[in-house]
Interface confidence: low
């Protein structure tokens, strides 16, 4: 804590300007009025204060606003934001997207810090849901943000927000998360025509059920192998050879390279070998001709 000392004669700050960089820490404490600092926060960023001097300025704001800073101050914190602790941020009530953007900009290019995570949490909780504009902003700064949320948290994402999601935002999502996001995406894009719909829905297909994959196979979509490999195994298994051939289009050749990997491996085991042979890819491991494929969950009860 900086010791309380009287401000030397003639040094009282009339405004926040570059002359203050020559003040010692105790002079800043004594000569800068906290209320003046609060009203001229937007100037602080343009002045090359040292870290020690920024500590003094933060201390003054903390004294002025012990219950938490008002948004008018928060929006102009700039690099002073990096001095804040998660405990400081929990006292804030941030409602403006512009404020959020301004603070995320300060941390741009770095991993999501505990401060940023706390800020986002406060902001989203304040809004009640992850609306499109918020999601747009957050994924622009942190592409992996969406996949850092639990399935429960994702359930609060309204379908309209899905338009803000880019393919790279879903790179690290696991199947449980895609199970939640896929129905929302399907709803969001339901009025698009076939080709445009596939472009949009493709990244979410890791959550798609079998019936939706069957429908897509009728629409000349030409799914790439990387997308196919991310589909749910249980959704792929019931697909016929003809349906997979239509689904993949020119990419069907890639099945050969993936025949040892899921879901292709498990799918091959469920197909009749003579059906697989029609692909001309040399896929092996199907059910030998003459065998019956049983689904024991559907066998008839013995009388």
């Amino acid at each position: 804590e900086v010791e309380k000392t009287a401000c030397p004669s003639g040094k009282k700050a009339r405004e926040i300007d570059e002359s203050l960089i020559f003040y010692k820490k105790w002079e800043l404490e004594a000569c800068v009025d906290a209320a003046l600092l609060a009203t001229q926060m937007d100037r602080v960023n343009a002045i090359p204060f040292t870290y020690e001097q920024l500590d003094v300025l933060k201390h003054k704001l903390d004294e002025l606003y012990p219950q938490g800073y008002p948004e008018s101050v928060i929006q102009h914190l700039g690099y002073l934001f990096l001095k804040m602790s998660p405990e400081d941020i929990r006292k804030w009530n941030v409602t403006s997207l512009e404020t959020l953007k301004a603070l995320l900009e300060v941390n741009k290019g770095h991993e999501m810090s505990p401060q940023v995570a706390t800020l986002i949490d406060r902001f989203v909780k304040g809004r009640g849901q992850l609306d499109k504009d918020t999601l747009d902003t957050l994924t622009a700064f942190y592409p992996g943000y969406l996949c850092s949320l639990s399935p429960e948290e994702l359930s609060s994402v309204p379908p309209s927000s899905i338009w803000a999601v880019r393919p790279q935002d879903l790179d690290t999502c696991d199947p449980r998360q895609l199970d939640v996001l896929y129905p929302k995406a399907r709803l969001a894009f339901q009025n698009m025509n076939g080709s445009e719909y596939f472009v949009k829905i493709q990244s979410f297909l890791g959550g798609a059920p079998t019936e939706d994959l069957k429908a897509l196979s009728q629409q000349n979509v030409s799914m790439d192998l990387a997308t196919f490999m991310k589909l749910r195994t249980d959704a792929v298994l019931p697909l016929t050879v003809a349906e997979v051939q239509k689904l993949l289009g020119p990419h069907v050749e890639g099945l050969k390279a993936e025949e040892r990997h899921r879901p292709v491996r498990d799918w091959i085991l469920r197909q009749r070998q003579d059906d697989l042979d029609t692909l001309g890819l040399g896929l092996q491991g199907g059910i030998p001709n003459g065998y019956l494929v049983l689904d024991l969950s559907m066998q008839e009860a013995l009388s």
Epitope: P167, Q168, D171, S195, N220, V221, S222, D224, L225, A226, T227, M229, G249, P250, H251, E253, G254, K256, A257, E258
Partner: antibody
Framework: EVQLQQSGPELVKPGTSVKISCKAS????????MHWVKQGHVKSLEWIGR????????NYNQNFKDKASLTVEKSSSTAYMGLHSLTSEDSAVYYC????????WGQGTTLTVSS | QAVVTQESALTTSPGETVTLTCRSS?????????ANWVQEKPDHLFTGLIA???NRAPGVPARFSGSLIGDKAALTITGAQPEDEAMFFC?????????FGGGTKLTVL
């Protein structure tokens, strides 16, 4: 932003080999096939082949099967095309391409084969 | 190997609709040929426009559309703009490989 950054122009002698690189950024590298295309002096295009960066599986245009070899280095998100036993016929601009008409093209690498 | 043929040159005016076509020597072009369309501007600047017959690539203006017309693949520009003046190539899939057409030089006067 998706970008495909290719290596610079090459001037090589007949009979030698060359390796062109294509560094991908802005998307998951293993999630998309990488194609290679040749643009000759008459400005027409020829498809050389494509590689699945996830598995390394390759489809070649039969006309280039003995001329080109496609590889990838997943750790650096880079695709490579080697061209062998070069002749003046191989002088052209070569492109790496993600998804042909549905995607993104590199800026091209000019290869000049001359003694 | 199949030969893919395009108009060598077409001329249109700003605001007009123009259609470029792509023919296969092996017969009618179908959805199984997955027609792709690519634009080339000066200095080797290529941009993907259409994939899988009619799937517009991300960021491509809505005035570009792909279809099948008769036995050919087609690229239609509805309301051509001066900046659409370029070379346009189609590519067709023949089961194991792609073949490009010779390209159409589009002039927008």
């Amino acid at each position: 932003e998706v970008q495909l950054q290719q290596s610079g122009p090459e001037l090589v002698k007949p009979g030698t080999s060359v390796k062109i690189s294509c560094k991908a950024s802005g998307y998951p590298f293993t999630g998309h096939y990488m194609h290679w295309v040749k643009q000759g002096h008459v400005k027409s295009l020829e498809w050389i082949g494509r590689i699945n960066p996830y598995t390394g599986a390759i489809n070649y245009n039969q006309n280039f099967k003995d001329k080109a070899s496609l590889t990838v280095e997943k750790s650096s998100s880079t695709a490579y095309m080697g061209l062998h036993s070069l002749t003046s016929e191989d002088s052209a601009v070569y492109y790496c391409v993600r998804d042909l008409g549905g995607g993104y093209w590199g800026q091209g690498t000019t290869l000049t084969v001359s003694s | 190997q199949a030969v893919v043929t395009q108009e060598s040159a077409l001329t249109t005016s700003p605001g007009e609709t123009v259609t470029l076509t792509c023919r296969s020597s092996t017969g009618a072009v179908t959805t199984s040929n997955y027609a792709n369309w690519v634009q080339e501007k000066p200095d080797h600047l290529f941009t993907g426009l259409i994939a899988g017959t009619n799937n517009r690539a991300p960021g491509v203006p809505a005035r570009f559309s792909g279809s099948l017309i008769g036995d050919k693949a087609a690229l239609t520009i509805t309301g051509a703009q001066p900046e659409d003046e370029a070379m346009f190539f189609c590519a067709l899939w023949f089961g194991s490989h792609w073949v490009f057409g010779g390209g159409t030089k589009l002039t927008v006067l």
